[in-house]
């Protein structure tokens, strides 16, 4: 069962799945000036059996100008250089995501893919949040969200995370004045927020996201 919507938006935070449950779909989208190859799939799908999960299909982009040339799916060195790593303190040991039964790992990038990935998650998927560079986390509880099915409808649990600018410090996290409520923030105010993916996973995260490095964002 696919989740009706995307995980909640938290101001100045990004979210990331550490592994993708079977049934997850990833849009095959290309950056401007490129398009999917003719008869190329619109989606990659995480599928598998009891022992192994993998993405069916490969996303492929070709130049909009050149009608019949197929671009390779391996990223070029200069494309990889475009990505910037943001580290948080105390990195943990990486985990092999393939060891999670019924889950797929992050698909490798494909050449000329769009600047952000659009995933369609399934019920039971968990995503983890962290503050973007320049903001720090104030925790009221777990910085994670799970897609749950209740009364025949899907919903995401609300992550208990507030991201505050590093300049705004107070002695106790409890005294910190939140910048905005996690809910009800207008779409127009979230331009700094890059949700779902564009990340290469470097570590497993602690459930509360206290200690991890995990983002490698497109700029």
């Amino acid at each position: 069962e696919l989740c009706d919507d995307d995980p909640p938006e938290i101001p100045h935070a990004t979210f990331k799945a550490m592994a993708y449950k079977e049934g997850t779909m990833l849009n095959c989208e290309c950056k401007r000036g490129f398009r999917r190859i003719k008869s190329g799939s619109l989606y990659m799908l995480c599928t598998g059996n009891s022992s192994h999960s993998s993405w069916d299909n490969q996303c492929q982009c070709t130049s909009s100008a050149t009608r019949n040339t197929t671009k390779q799916v391996t990223p070029q060195p200069e494309e990889q250089k475009e990505r910037k790593t943001t580290e948080m303190q105390s990195p943990m040991q990486p985990v092999d995501q393939a060891s999670l039964p019924g889950h797929c790992r992050e698909p490798p990038p494909w050449e000329n893919e769009a600047t952000e990935r659009i995933y369609h998650f399934v019920v039971g998927q968990m995503v983890y949040y962290q503050c973007v560079q320049g903001y720090r986390a104030l925790h009221r509880g777990p910085a994670e969200s799970v897609c749950k099915m209740t009364h025949g409808k899907t919903r995401w649990t609300q992550p208990q995370l507030i991201c505050t600018g590093e300049m705004e410090t107070s002695q106790f996290p409890g005294e910190e004045k939140p910048q905005a409520s996690p809910e009800g923030r207008p779409e127009s105010e979230t331009s700094c927020l890059v949700t779902t993916t564009d990340f290469q996973i470097q570590t497993e995260m602690a459930a509360t996201m206290e200690t991890s490095i995990f983002t490698t964002e497109y700029q």
Epitope: D4, D5, R36, G40, S41, L42, Y43, L45, E187, T195
Partner: antibody, heavy 115, light 107 residues
């Protein structure tokens, strides 16, 4: 709850253009996939194209390429479909719909092309 | 483009009967197939996506099956409100395409 609300009916002259709007509420508009589908009187459904606002990526059906433009305004959570060089056979109900499996639909906008 | 052929064009049945609608794709669409119900003057309503997953709020008398090129929508026991036109649609590759529709009418 997601809702897609479309602009009202239009009567246009052949050769002119029409711009239909689709305002979304609920969910994260910028990450929506907004599709446009039309239905001529008594006919079936026909896909015209789509946009993903956060990516600024549009795709169009070959039949409408060059004649249709799909745009999105993230600040107002509104998608637009503009069809130019109208002819009588473009008389149809135009729908916007979310995702590629069209889980939510607008109520439809009747565009009548008549001289 | 992928052509979807629906059959039969019209299905005449009585309330309480079972309806079986078919949709055949000109090439494989994997499980990227959806079914819609449309009543006169209304927008279509999503019934099934992913070939077999029921959309939110859809009664369990509606079920979908199949993968690849052959798909079926089954309405186990027709209710009076089920008489409508049904469309299949593929979203495996661009352009997205629809079948021509099957009208389920009261016999």
């Amino acid at each position: 709850q997601v809702q897609l609300v479309q602009s009202g009916a239009e009567v246009k002259k052949p050769g002119s253009s029409v711009k239909v709007s689709c305002k979304a509420s609920g969910g994260t508009f910028s990450r929506y996939i907004i599709n446009w589908v039309r239905q001529a009187p008594g006919q079936g459904l026909e896909w015209m194209g789509r946009i993903i606002p956060i990516l600024g990526v549009e795709n169009y059906a070959q039949k409408f390429q060059g004649r249709v433009t799909i745009t999105a305004d993230k600040s107002t959570s509104t998608a637009y479909m503009e069809l130019s060089s109208l002819r009588s056979e473009d008389t149809a109900v135009y729908y916007c719909a979310r995702k590629d499996w069209f889980d939510y639909w607008g109520q439809g906008t009747l565009v009548t092309v008549s001289s | 483009e992928i052509v979807l052929t629906q059959s039969p064009g019209t299905l005449s049945l009585s309330p309480g009967e079972r309806a079986t609608l078919s949709c055949r794709a000109s090439q494989s669409v994997s499980s990227y197939l959806a079914w819609y119900q449309q009543k006169p003057g209304q927008a279509p309503r999503l019934l099934i996506y992913g070939a077999s997953s029921r959309a939110t709020g859809i009664p369990d008398r509606f079920s979908g099956s199949g993968s690849g090129t052959d798909f079926t929508l089954t309405i186990s026991r027709l209710e009076p409100e089920d008489f409508a036109v049904y469309y299949c649609q593929q979203y495996g590759s661009s352009p997205l395409t629809f079948g021509g529709g099957t009208k389920v009418e009261i016999k």
